[in-house]
């Protein structure tokens, strides 16, 4: 890579594009800002669909996060000859649908979606727009919006979870490329660390998970710390703060040397989780340490 | 376990509104994401989806019986209601509703429905 | 709408693998499920999203979906898999089934 910021996060990526007529001579810019910035989410545990829509919705790459398989996609994606309308609310629906097949698996990874148009929406088409990203929510994502061109940034601001959720590129497609970076910081929940990651058996801790996005959540009292212990049983905690670039948690009291817990996070009130490789483990304590 | 029950009249005259009842168990359509189909079956015949109700209260139909139909639900009593307005022979055929939202994975045992005079 | 297409019938020996057809315009792009039916039964869901299998179906019930093409395989297929088949997608808030197929176990 280029050496530029990337992201560590565990989650399900979605790209909406729009590959309506309006965009033809403009296809090359969408390619490389989605490839560009494809290449920054980096965790083993991050899967991503490309979804593209114009008259029709289709699910290009379906959810994966097989590298091999994403480089494929992003090939596909490069294939992509724009044409026909701006129904965005059918590529929200295959988004949804997604969603809903992994959430019906039984464990709920957190959802990002990250959707691009140019232009104004029809009002039916937008009310259609804005219930399917409606629907995305239910399901427990993170809807954030790109608008290039012509875009009708309050009507944005609503198929998006809020205002600060839409990415206004006002200079056209080719200043798409300026916005990869407050995107990605934007669109990025990522655990980091934890400390301490070795704990006492049998002793109530806090911990502190250091990362990044913790308050991009729609409403961060809805934020939670997940510890998956020993692979089974998943307990939730409510933090004690949140800040964008941490957590203080209080930790569960693991009674034996040697259980794991592998920490996530849920932005919506455990409807979903954000996956790490961070894992809290336990040893023994002396009364004197 | 999940459970959902069709009731409603065997017999309908021509012309007539036919009203159908799903009453279900085992979840709750209080819960995100799902919700409850109707699909019917002629005779000998392929299934056919008719509508869809989702747990936010978003309703959809069948483009070719639209203005026929009406879904609604009642969340304290787990029941969804169809109601099929102005019955045909045609519509002879037994009516299952189905718990799902993209896919349906618990379906009712079907309640068939003859349209005569 | 999309529209699915299936084979009206498909007739597999006992221990044979039965492989069943569901066509439709770019059918790669969306994802496509597969229901089981006996007679004077509600249907059943064997496969869901192209692929996973709900709990309780056997593993010889297996799904692939690309290009304009989706297809249920029964490996080893068993007398008790003898029932119409049909396969149903998502498209523009509807949910719509194939024709169906009548599976048919030889002997």
């Known amino acids: 890579e280029d050496g530029g910021p990337a992201c560590y996060g565990g989650f399900d990526l979605y790209f909406i594009l729009d590959k309506s007529g309006s965009v033809l001579h403009h296809w090359n810019e969408i390619y490389y800002f989605v490839e560009q910035l494809a290449h920054r989410f980096i965790s083993p545990q991050l899967r991503m669909s490309f979804i593209v829509f114009s008259t029709r919705g289709t699910t290009l790459m379906k959810l994966t996060e097989d590298r091999e398989q994403i480089r494929q996609g992003l090939e596909e994606l490069q294939k992509v000859l724009p044409g026909g309308d701006t129904y965005m609310h059918e590529g929200f629906e295959r988004a949804s649908e997604q969603i809903y097949y992994e959430n019906s698996q039984g464990y709920r990874t957190a959802s990002v979606i990250i959707a691009l148009t140019d232009g104004e929406l029809h009002e039916d088409l937008f009310f259609y727009s804005e219930r399917e990203a409606n629907r995305s929510r239910d399901l427990g994502a993170i809807v954030y919006c790109v608008g290039v061109k012509d875009f009708n940034e309050t009507q944005l601001a609503r198929i998006a979870d809020s205002k600060d959720h839409v990415f206004p590129v006002n200079d056209g497609f080719q200043a798409l490329q300026g916005i990869i970076h407050s995107i990605l910081k934007k669109s990025c929940i990522e655990i980091l660390a934890a400390e301490p990651s070795t704990i006492c058996a049998g002793e109530s801790f806090q911990v502190v998970v250091r990362g990044n996005g913790f308050r991009h959540a729609r409403n961060v009292d809805r934020v939670l710390c997940s510890f998956k212990i020993n692979d089974s049983v998943t307990l939730n905690e409510k933090p004690f703060a949140v800040e964008d670039t941490y957590l203080l948690c209080p930790a569960p009291i693991l009674k034996e040397v040697g259980m794991k817990a592998a920490l996530q996070v849920s932005m919506n009130d455990g409807l979903s989780f954000i996956s790490s490789s961070v894992i809290i483990t336990t040893t023994h304590c002396s009364d004197g340490s | 376990q999940v459970q959902l029950k069709e009731s409603g009249p065997a017999l309908v005259k021509p012309t007539q509104t036919l009203t159908l009842t799903c009453t279900f168990s085992?979840?709750?359509?209080?819960?995100?994401?799902?919700?409850v189909s109707w699909i019917r079956q002629p005779p000998g015949k392929a299934l056919e989806w008719l509508a869809h109700i989702y747990s936010n209260d978003d309703k959809s139909y069948s483009t070719s019986l639209k203005t026929r139909l009406t879904i609604s639900k009642d969340t304290s009593k787990n029941q969804v209601v169809l109601t099929m307005t102005n019955m045909d022979p045609v519509d002879t055929a037994t009516y299952y509703c189905?718990?799902?939202?993209?896919?349906?994975?618990?379906w009712g045992q079907g309640t068939l429905v003859t349209v005569s005079s | 709408d999309i529209e699915l297409t299936q084979p009206p019938s498909v007739s597999v020996a006992p221990g044979q693998t039965a492989r069943i057809s569901c066509s439709g315009d770019?059918?790669?792009?969306?994802?496509v499920h597969w229901y089981q039916q006996k007679p004077g039964q509600a249907p059943v869901l064997v496969i869901y999203?192209?692929?996973k299998r709900p709990s309780g179906i056997p593993e010889r019930f297996s799904g692939s979906n690309s290009g304009n093409t989706a297809t249920l395989t029964i490996s080893g297929t068993q007398a008790e898999d003898e029932a119409d088949y049909y396969c149903q997608s998502y498209d523009i808030t509807s949910l719509v089934f194939g024709g169906g197929t009548k599976l048919t176990v030889l002997g």
């Open positions: 999203a192209d692929s």
């Open positions: 085992g979840f709750s359509l209080s819960t995100s994401g799902g919700g």
């Open positions: 189905a718990r799902g939202g993209y896919f349906l994975d618990y």
């Open positions: 770019n059918i790669g792009g969306i994802y």
